[in-house]
Structures are given as structure tokens and as C-alpha cells.
């Protein structure tokens, strides 16, 4: 999906007002300096191809994370303020039905949710010199 | 403006399965999660579980233990939700209700009018 | 799960006086996931308070919501005649979703 049309500016509010205390809760317990950030973006349509990836599609380790909190209202936030994103998920999510396991919070997930938490502070400093 | 409306109340007997539909419009349904709530005769609210009818993902609370299975029908704009193996217990009335950002806060922004299901030998 | 406490469960109050609906949370919460909903007898539940104290469109400055962490508050300034009903709190904080039992306002 080329995330190029979406309201950006609502989409940086939806995750200020909720997202982000949603990441918050996830990480509870862990300390900020606890991962570093391996994954960046460059750009806004970028930072959202890049939280896309990391939210919704299972990784080694981490298979869990399109069920939680912060993943449901991410994507109503996509849907809603991405024009015909929601109509290009079908494919992707049965795919991912397939493999989802139970819930289980990881270190492996902990690490997957700090990366994007940075991704998202990338994107809502959208006119920042990439590091 | 944005409109949920129900199917018809039904009466059940103890061990069927009843559906029962809710059709929205003024809106794009398929990028909105639809959840369903219900409402035991003088008590109060149960959430049940919710679609997401882009994709068809679903969250269901486990309190129902797989007999609820909630759908949607993207051409006609309608959710769905099933309960199974029905007891008398459930015998309320079922909401189906709208998830959306409001000021960029997330909640049950619209609900439907309301089905009653009576559970009855 | 999180379990929604609302009290007191009956609120016998006068036309005019202030009423103080409580909602207690058994794990904390952001703000920003805290929900007030009205119903009326026979009715749909109504949005109210969104995020603890964002007004829902419509609805009168004598209302106000307040709270963070395990303890939420609506507060009624002044009521009126129409402002009798059952208020629930509800959090989208984690699945499941859950609902307070409600306070019911009631005309003293």
C-alpha cells in the first residue's frame, strides 16, 4: 500500500491522543534505554509503510502483536485517514490469520514495540534530518 | 449521517442458535471496527466482540468461549453475530455498535437500536 | 481482564443539587481510554465522556469527567430533569472490554 495520500496530521493525532499511551502500556515495566533502535524512516509515508510492517506482520520470536490494543486502533487509524487502505489488508490478513499464535508477551515483542515506538516518534517529526 | 440498524427481536429455544444483523450506513463500512455489546434484562453491558470488515479480523471475549462468531458483509454493508448453544441467560438485548476516533479518541462512537433475544422453553 | 467498580449504584439525588459518579479500575489506565455512556430506560447507550472528561457533541457544560490511573469521576454540577438515567464507564484499554455496572441517577 503506498501510504502517500494518507492525513497524516489525524493520524498524528490519533496516536498522540491513544496510540501512544497504548505502547506505553504494552512496555510497561521495561526501561527506555532497555533496546536500541535498529529499524528508521525517512519519511512519513515511509514511517507508516515501516509501523505497518512491524505491527501487523508476524516476525521471528514475535508473532503476537496484531492482537493487542495499539494494533486494533492503529489500523482504524490507517483505515479511516488512508484512502483504500483497508480494501488492500484482505490478502495480508488471512494470510496472517494462518499463522497467528497465542497472545504471549515476548522480549522478542517488548524489542519489536520499542522499534516501534521510534518509528512513530520518526514520523511525527516528519521535517527532522534523518540521523 | 451514520446509521446502524438492527434485525427484529427474536424469541429461541434453549440449545439453538440465533443471528442477528445490523446495517450500517453513512459511512465507509469497511474501514470501521463493528463490536457487539449486550444488556441482560436489568443489568448491565457485556461486550461480546468485534470485526474489523475491511479483513474480516476478529476479537471475541473469551467469557463466550467460542459460541459467539461475529461476520460482515462488505456488499451490503451489514455485520453480523452469532450466538450458539443458547440458555436461558442469554436472553437480552444485543447491541451492535460503531468504533471510531472522536477528537482522536477511541470509542464506541454509534450504536444500533437494540435486539431483543428471548432464551425460552 | 479489568474489572469496572461503579459507585454508588443508586444515586437518589434533587433537581439542582451536584452528583458524583465514581468509577474505580482494578488495574491503571490512560486517561485517554476512559468512557462515560447515558441510557435511558428503553434507549440505545449514549456516548457521553470520551478520554475521561472530553465532552461528546451535545452534551451540557454542567457535566465534567475527571480522574487517572485506578479512579475516574463524572460529575454532574447541577441536574435537570433530563439528565435521569444509567451512566456506565468503560475502558478500551485491554480486551476484554468492560463496562462499570452502572449508576443509576434517580429523582429523590
Known amino acids: 500500500y503506498d501510504f502517500t495520500n494518507c492525513d497524516f496530521e489525524k493520524i498524528k493525532a490519533a496516536y498522540l491522543s491513544t496510540i501512544s499511551k497504548d505502547l506505553i502500556t504494552y512496555m510497561s515495566g521495561t526501561k527506555s534505554t532497555e533496546f536500541n533502535n535498529t529499524v528508521s524512516c525517512s519519511n512519513r509515508p515511509h514511517c507508516l509503510t515501516e509501523i505497518q510492517s512491524l505491527t501487523f506482520n508476524p516476525t521471528a520470536g514475535c508473532a503476537s502483536l496484531a492482537k493487542e490494543m495499539f494494533a486494533m486502533k492503529t489500523k482504524a487509524a490507517l483505515a479511516i485517514w488512508c484512502p483504500g487502505y483497508s480494501e488492500t489488508q484482505i490478502n495480508a490478513t488471512q494470510a496472517m490469520k494462518k499463522r497467528r499464535k497465542r497472545k504471549v508477551t515476548t522480549n522478542k515483542c517488548l524489542e519489536q514495540v520499542s522499534q516501534l515506538q521510534g518509528l512513530w516518534r520518526r514520523f511525527n517529526r516528519p521535517l527532522l534530518k534523518q540521523q | 449521517q451514520v446509521q446502524l440498524v438492527q434485525s427484529g427481536a427474536e424469541v429461541k429455544k434453549p440449545g439453538s442458535s440465533v443471528k442477528v444483523s445490523c446495517k450500517a450506513s453513512?459511512?465507509?463500512?469497511?474501514?470501521?471496527?463493528m463490536n457487539w455489546v449486550r444488556q441482560a434484562p436489568g443489568q448491565g453491558l457485556e461486550w461480546m466482540g468485534q470485526i474489523f470488515p475491511g479483513d474480516g479480523e476478529t476479537n471475541y471475549n473469551g467469557k463466550f468461549k467460542g459460541r459467539v462468531t461475529i461476520t460482515a458483509d462488505k456488499s451490503t454493508s451489514t455485520a453480523y453475530m452469532e450466538l450458539s448453544s443458547l440458555r436461558s441467560e442469554d436472553t437480552a438485548v444485543y447491541y451492535c455498535?460503531?468504533?471510531?476516533?472522536?477528537?482522536?479518541?477511541?470509542?464506541?462512537?454509534?450504536w444500533g437500536q437494540g435486539t431483543t433475544v428471548t432464551v425460552s422453553s | 481482564e479489568i474489572v469496572m467498580t461503579q459507585s454508588p449504584a443508586t444515586l437518589s439525588v434533587s433537581p439542582g443539587e451536584r452528583a458524583t459518579l465514581s468509577c474505580s479500575v482494578s488495574s491503571s489506565i490512560s486517561s485517554s481510554n476512559l468512557h462515560w455512556y447515558q441510557q435511558k430506560p428503553g434507549q440505545s447507550p449514549r456516548p457521553w465522556i470520551y478520554?475521561?472528561?472530553t465532552l461528546a457533541s451535545g452534551i451540557p457544560a454542567r457535566f465534567s469527567g475527571s480522574g487517572s490511573g485506578t479512579e475516574f469521576t463524572l460529575t454532574i454540577s447541577s441536574l435537570q430533569s433530563e439528565d435521569f438515567a444509567v451512566y456506565y464507564c468503560?475502558?478500551?484499554?485491554?480486551?476484554?472490554?468492560?463496562f462499570g455496572g452502572g449508576t443509576k441517577v434517580e429523582i429523590k
Open positions: 455498535a460503531r468504533g471510531g476516533y472522536v477528537n482522536f479518541l477511541y470509542a464506541m462512537d454509534y
Open positions: 453513512g459511512y465507509a463500512f469497511s474501514s470501521y471496527w
Open positions: 478520554g475521561t472528561s
Open positions: 468503560q475502558q478500551w484499554s485491554s480486551y476484554p472490554l468492560t
